[in-house]
Interface confidence: low
Amino acid sequence: REVLVPEGPLYRVAGTAVSISCNVTGYEGPAQQNFEWFLYRPEAPDTALGIVSTKDTQFSYAVFKSRVVAGEVQVQRLQGDAVVLKIARLQAQDAGIYECHTPSTDTRYLGSYSGKVELRVLPDVLQVSAAPPGPRGRQAPTSPPRMTVHEGQELALGCLARTSTQKHTHLAVSFGRSVPEAPVGRSTLQEVVGIRSDLAVEAGAPYAERLAAGELRLGKEGTDRYRMVVGGAQAGDAGTYHCTAAEWIQDPDGSWAQIAEKRAVLAHVDVQTLSSQLAVTVGPGERRIGPGEPLELLCNVSGALPPAGRHAAYSVGWEMAPAGAPGPGRLVAQLDTEGVGSLGPGYEGRHIAMEKVASRTYRLRLEAARPGDAGTYRCLAKAYVRGSGTRLREAASARSRPLPVHVREEGVVLEAVAWLAGGTVYRGETASLLCNISVRGGPPGLRLAASWWVERPEDGELSSVPAQLVGGVGQDGVAELGVRPGGGPVSVELVGPRSHRLRLHSLGPEDEGVYHCAPSAWVQHADYSWYQAGSARSGPVTVYPYMHALDT
């Protein structure tokens, strides 16, 4: 028979729990063996004090009786031949030599019937407290402090953990978080990051990725100061932060045992999310302007937001939905997080400026509005946060209320009358088509353009092929030539303030077709861009190149 207890001495700390195992091998008799525990105190090394027994409930000496009854000292059977002695709260007078004795069930006395191990009780000298993580922000004079950090900002917390245990021990320090106002216990405390006794840094499951990305850092500064930095705070980082220090000692058998643990509340942390703060307003209110006038709209981004820079960035854009159109509309212009402006599709050729006029005020300016610019405008702001890395993450976006913009129509009415000079034209001659334009309304400086189009008959009928441009004169007076069916020379010109002429030289049979004149009225804006204010289409003019009698 052999009774086995741990190799000693064991060092444990007053006030903490201790477990001492005992098992028996090589015995005869029933599989379920009984165990008796005794203590020999240093001041009376020959006196065995009965602690607890698996067989006799009255076994305990007076010094242990009340603690055994209270369940503070107990023997717990692991299996028939193994038990563990558990003492819930060690006292200084619990130091001494513990003996585990197994009453004999053997046919003859053989081997050892007890094992002894010394337990030494160390004073509780582990200290844990909050330490300022560096320069402190504005904190209410509460204990623990209440801290508010902006989303995307760094959250830094410090912890002081020290021990003056005379034995060689290691400290493990971890930072944990519990949801605000939750009771603190192992089940509610979620580990954020910790330094093990071997100085390895480990993060709790939800934080491992951030530790690997360098967004979560934990370092030891000096002998007893630990600092955790959470880069790029997120809404889920809000809560009560704790620091837990555990003191470990290496037992003679080489295994490590935790001999003390203490926890301190560091701070109640609120994370002010950008989505809860970001607000966008627009001004100056409903706008009514004439065509060609500048349109200026202001967008103000407000809220308790961190300034743009290291941890936060903002982009601001304007969207426009034509009157009556659903949805947010199309992008007009935007400033990205770097302050670089760009125009939306369809606005590229326009004189449009988007600029930051104050720290949080942005202005959209269309140098010369057009009737097509009428609609509802919204300002869209996006807030981004940057963690420890350089990549930005969109954290919030907000749209302003719609701001209606009305642009008066030009009110230009055009009419066009076209005809073939001379009425009849022969092959080889020149056909002259004239177009007279009349204009009603419109601003001063209105310019006219006119183009000539032809539809050619196929098998005696007008084809379904769209009309082809033959030629025209633009609002700037520049002639543009298209394709003449017969391939001969074409000339287009302005022959009066409201009269345009198309000439088809050396007519051939391929020039047969139905021609029309399409005038358009144009307004030039202050930004030198042109806006089409009106258009019309003349009636059809048939050109049929007759053959001279000699041609037959």
């Epitope: 993580p133 560096g134 320069p135 402190r136 922000g137 504005r138 950090v149 900002q153 760094e154 959250l155 830094a156 961190p306 300034p307 743009a308 820079g309 290291r310 941890h311 104050a358 720290s359 949080r360 005020t361």
Partner: antibody, heavy 123, light 105 residues
Framework: AVTLDESGGGLQTPGGGLSLVCKAS????????MQWVRQAPGKGLEWVAG????????AYAPAVKGRATISRDNGQSTVRLQLNNLRAEDTGTYYC????????????????WGHGTEVIVSS | ALTQPSSVSANPGETVKITCSGS?????YGWYQQKSPGSAPVTLI????KRPSDIPSRFSGSKSGSTGTLTITGVQADDEAVYFC??????????FGAGTTLTVL
């Protein structure tokens, strides 16, 4: 060249108020955040207050919060620090400082300093 | 406040490093030289490593982790001064270190 000239210092009585003015020249003040920094006799630099480019963001050190008001007039190229309920510990040289950004509220972004104006709070 | 050593000393021509830690806000440091109390500080470095054009290249700045460092390469007698670091806390207010006195032996 960038120049910052502070004025308004001198002997002040405890409980009273003072108004310091910083006049800027050589750059467009409207594009930069401005700050006030002070230095007590024999002591280090202490950040007092900051105001961003258009005056929409202001911040104050805990020692002066509630007693100080920082303001700016970009048209006049001036920045003002009003400090009320003066205490003996407000004694020192007050510097006006220009930052490199429009809005930082950060003492690590200063690129120009004034020569300072001395304030003595004593009865 | 920010943490920086109270004093450092060096022989002429040597390299000196002054550290500054504790910025819980932006994490961006500036370095300022003051030759005598009451005289205006001079900006040596801003934004961790940017040097104004009129500052000699022997002054340089860097940042590693949460610590900023001012390096003076080839120290000269004229560099004897108090050096302050500045940064921000996490409530967007400025803060300074207590200052480091450089003695050139």
């Amino acid at each position: 060249a960038v120049t910052l000239d502070e004025s308004g210092g001198g002997l002040q009585t405890p409980g009273g108020g003072l108004s310091l003015v910083c006049k800027a020249s050589g750059f467009s003040i409207s594009s930069y955040e401005m700050q006030w920094v002070r230095q007590a006799p024999g002591k280090g630099l202490e950040w007092v207050a900051g105001i961003d480019d258009d005056g929409s963001s202001r911040a104050y050190a805990p020692a002066v919060k509630g007693r100080a008001t920082i303001s700016r007039d970009n048209g006049q190229s001036t920045v003002r620090l009003q400090l009320n309920n003066l205490r003996a510990e407000d004694t020192g040289t007050y510097y006006c400082a220009k930052t490199i950004y429009a809005a930082t509220l950060n003492a690590g972004e200063i690129d120009a300093w004034g020569h300072g104006t001395e304030v003595i709070v004593s009865s | 406040a920010l943490t920086q050593p109270s004093s450092v000393s060096a022989n002429p021509g040597e390299t000196v490093k002054i550290t500054c830690s504790g910025s819980s806000g932006s994490g961006y440091y500036g370095w300022y030289q003051q030759k005598s109390p009451g005289s205006a500080p001079v900006t040596l470095i801003y934004d961790n490593d940017k040097r104004p054009s009129d500052i000699p290249s022997r002054f340089s700045g860097s940042k590693s982790g949460s610590t900023g460092t001012l390096t003076i390469t080839g120290v000269q007698a004229d560099d004897e001064a108090v050096y302050f670091c500045g940064s921000a806390d996490n409530n967007y207010t400025g803060i300074f270190g207590a200052g480091t006195t450089l003695t050139v032996l």
